[in-house]
Interface confidence: medium
């Protein structure tokens, strides 16, 4: 999960496995101020999950969600 | 290159229990989702079991619930399927079959299959 | 719970198109996936999330999902080709997988 240092989200690990993709309802990306780039996946267990927007999966899925 | 290097042949009684491991090598199973699906013969794929990422809880499909198990040993890289209470139904070809992430969350990588025959 | 709907068999002479298809409700929105499986062996990812091949698979196959059913595409069917097919699906509302009934297809 993100840790939020006063309203700016930050994730310093990612997810090491692929969620899978109907888990997902929603993603954002964390600001630029935190130290690891990082998408926020909010899940359908309104979860946020943090994972590493260079793996393709992740890349995949916010294509996915863009377009629904 | 990255395999899943599952168990060899099972011959089990009505009513005992079988153990079916599956390997992962050249990756890391924690980067890894493991499902296991099995194939009775002459019959289609039926999926049976997965653990959630989000959580590490394992998901059972209706069927397998209460009498299925699956578990993971992250420090040999190893999967594990066991079933109980077995009956000639059971007999089959269990996959493991993984997500790597590389085609969103399609399995994958498959392993040879182990198959498990239940008979008196 | 979720059910994919496929034809038991389909038949095609070589050089000709095969189309597999997977009847489900309300496919649309959900990423189709097929497998092909040989005659003793594993099955095999062939196209993933209804329309992108797998590495590896050549380009004959295509995939395509219209919204209550998907369809594999085989172009220039090769006697090779001749396997059981599966679609699957994610079926959000039991959280499982859940595969077609298979569709044989055979090279005349």
């Known amino acids: 999960s993100p840790y939020s240092s006063d309203t700016t989200p930050c994730c310093f690990a990612y997810i090491a496995r692929p969620l899978p993709r109907a888990h997902i309802k929603e993603y954002f990306y964390t600001s630029g101020k935190c130290s690891n780039p990082a998408v926020v996946f909010v899940t359908r267990k309104n979860r946020q999950v943090c994972a590493n927007p260079e793996k393709k999966w992740v890349r995949e899925y916010i294509n996915s969600l863009e377009m629904s | 290159q990255v395999q899943l290097v599952q168990s060899g042949a099972e011959v089990k009684k009505p009513g005992a229990s079988v153990k079916v491991s599956c390997k992962v090598s050249?990756?890391?199973?924690?980067?890894?989702?493991i499902h296991w699906v099995r194939q009775a013969p002459g019959k289609g794929l039926e999926w049976m079991s997965y653990?959630?990422?989000?959580?590490?809880?394992?998901i059972y499909a209706q069927k397998f619930q209460g009498r299925a198990t699956m578990t993971e040993d992250s420090s040999t890289d190893t999967a594990y399927m066991e079933m109980g209470s077995l009956t000639s139904d059971d007999t089959a070809v269990y996959y493991c079959?993984?997500?790597?992430?590389?085609?969103?969350?399609?399995?994958?990588?498959w392993g040879r299959g182990t198959l498990v025959t239940v008979s008196s | 719970s979720y059910v994919l709907t496929q034809d038991p068999s389909v038949s095609v002479a070589p050089g000709q198109t095969a189309r597999i298809t997977c009847g489900g409700a309300?496919?649309?929105?959900?990423?189709v996936h097929w497998y092909q499986q040989k005659s003793g062996q594993a099955p095999v990812l062939v196209v993933s999330?209804?329309?992108d091949r797998a590495s590896g698979i050549p380009e004959r196959f295509s995939g395509s999902n219209s919204g209550t059913t998907a369809t594999l595409t085989l172009s220039r069917v090769e006697v090779g080709d001749e396997a059981d097919y599966y679609c699957q699906v994610w079926d959000s509302s039991s959280d499982h997988w859940v595969f077609g009934g298979r569709t044989k297809l055979t090279v005349l």
């Open positions: 653990i959630d990422p989000e959580d590490g809880e394992p």
């Open positions: 999330d209804n329309s």
């Open positions: 050249g990756y890391a199973l924690s980067e890894l989702s």
């Open positions: 309300n496919l649309w929105g959900l990423g």
């Open positions: 079959a993984g997500v790597t992430g590389s085609t969103s969350d399609a399995f994958d990588l």
